[in-house]
């Protein structure tokens, strides 16, 4: 026969019970605080070291770029692509056109300054978009020449040249001594038209996006 | 061989026109670009004017824009310039020039022996 | 415009002996490896006569005694050995921008 229980015993059973209960809540309790001030801190560190990193970059190009213009990018947006200002931007690329009239290598020269080249077009969408800034009127340098008169068309950033992704005027390129390539609006479009080096034009510089 | 011939220099007033005319033989002339260069008594050589192959492109300097004109006709293989509103500086020998494209740039490889315009009162 | 200085603006050589003529550019004439300067020799009463093209290439028919070299905004034509014939006043051109410009000239004199 199993002796009853004294009602203090059942009590303090209870009350025993509860203190195990209300003590492990109270140490998870302190241990999620713990955490979350870990996690906290640790992001905080790296949220902060990587703003840091992200203002040392900055830094160290506004020695070449006055004034940036970024906009964040990625899965997590948590990467900035930036262009100088007024540079505009598209994929990867930032663009620069220059209105100042100048021979094709002193347009190339110009670009290089700005850690640039002229304009390598490599679709029909990049030229869309870069034709959108431009004035009909007008004709442009790109990043296309063939120094020896030999109809080796060749990019200045060494980009292969395909006949397939070309946008020349009809009947164009049409003159051996016409050896760098610009863009221009004729019989309503734009396209290429080989003109002489030495006649000064406006031109178009390309960069890669700047990634901080 | 290649000949480039000038004639069509003179005395003339200021304010008066003369043309020039450059005669070539010798070489197709419609493939090739073709200068005026112009050289005043006892000085160096001053560049006047440039004309394309296919005609699409001519260029002056400053000091002639609005008052000379150059032209070719490639059907008689001839080279020309206009001059107006001539001025005592412009006085010198002028002559034509044929120009070879060197990689983004070009040379004169031939010289016409050159035809002297004097202008005075 | 490129200005095209040329020194000295003359020159007495002795037959056999060198002559160097120099020529600057206020601004580079060369893109890369194309050194886009020219060489003229002109003797009295006759129209200029190309020696050198891109600085450093002679003309066909010029003898091998005349040389150029250079690049950027430095170049120099030197004749050895100088002979008799070669009197006469040496430019330099450019043409890598328009307006295509000429230096003021050096005349070489044979003692």
């Known amino acids: 026969m199993v002796p009853e229980e004294e009602p203090q015993d059942r009590e303090k059973g209870v009350w025993w019970f509860q203190l195990k209960v209300w003590s492990v809540a109270v140490v998870s309790i302190l241990l999620l605080c713990v955490c979350f001030t870990v996690s906290s801190v640790a992001s905080h560190n790296f949220m902060y070291s990587k703003t840091v990193k992200r203002l040392s970059k900055l830094q160290e190009y506004q020695q070449y770029y006055p004034s940036l213009t970024c906009v964040m990018e990625g899965k997590d947006m948590e990467d900035w692509s930036c262009c100088p200002t007024p540079w505009t931007s598209f994929q990867s690329s930032c663009y620069f056109i220059s209105t100042v009239m100048q021979s094709w290598t002193k347009s190339q020269n110009n670009c290089s300054v700005m850690g640039a080249d002229l304009v390598v077009i490599n679709t029909k969408e990049e030229q869309d978009f870069i034709t959108q800034n431009l004035k009909i009127n007008s004709a442009y340098f790109l990043g296309l020449s063939d120094p020896k008169g030999w109809r080796h068309w060749q990019w200045v950033d060494q980009t292969p040249y395909n006949k397939n992704v070309t946008f020349w005027h009809s009947g164009e390129p049409n003159s051996p001594d016409e050896r760098c390539a610009i863009i221009n609006f004729r019989s309503e479009e734009w396209g290429w038209n080989d003109v002489h080096c030495h006649v000064p034009q406006k031109s178009i510089c390309k960069m890669k996006k700047i990634y901080i | 061989e290649v000949q480039l011939v000038e004639s069509g220099g003179g005395l003339v007033k200021p304010g008066g026109s003369l043309r020039l005319s450059c005669a070539a033989s010798?070489?197709?002339?419609?493939?090739?670009?073709m200068s005026w260069v112009r050289q005043a008594p006892g000085k160096g050589l001053e560049w006047v004017s440039t004309i394309s192959s296919g005609d699409s492109y001519t260029y002056y300097p400053d000091s002639v824009k609005g008052r000379f004109t150059i032209s070719r006709d490639n059907a008689k293989n001839s080279l020309y310039l206009q001059m107006n509103s001539l001025r005592a500086e412009d006085t010198a020998v002028y002559y034509c020039?044929?120009?070879?494209?060197?990689?983004?740039?070009?040379?004169?490889?031939?010289w016409g022996q050159g035809t002297t315009v004097t202008v005075s009162s | 415009d490129i200005v095209l200085t040329q020194s000295p603006a003359s020159l007495a050589v002795s037959p056999g002996q060198r002559a160097t003529i120099t020529c600057r550019a206020s601004?580079?004439?060369?893109?890369?490896?194309?050194?886009?300067m020219h060489w003229y020799q002109q003797k009295p009463g006759q129209p200029p006569k190309l020696l050198i093209y891109g600085a450093s290439n002679l003309e066909s028919g010029v003898p091998a005694r005349f040389s150029g070299s250079g690049s950027e905004t430095d170049f120099t034509l030197t004749i050895n050995p100088v002979e008799a014939e070669d009197t006469a006043n040496y430019f330099c051109q450019q043409s890598i921008e328009d307006p295509p410009t000429f230096g003021g000239g050096t005349k070489v004199e044979i003692k």
């Open positions: 020039a044929r120009q070879i494209y060197y990689d983004y740039a070009y040379y004169f490889d031939f």
């Open positions: 010798g070489f197709t002339f419609s493939s090739y670009g």
């Open positions: 601004e580079s004439v060369s893109f890369r490896t194309s050194h886009l």
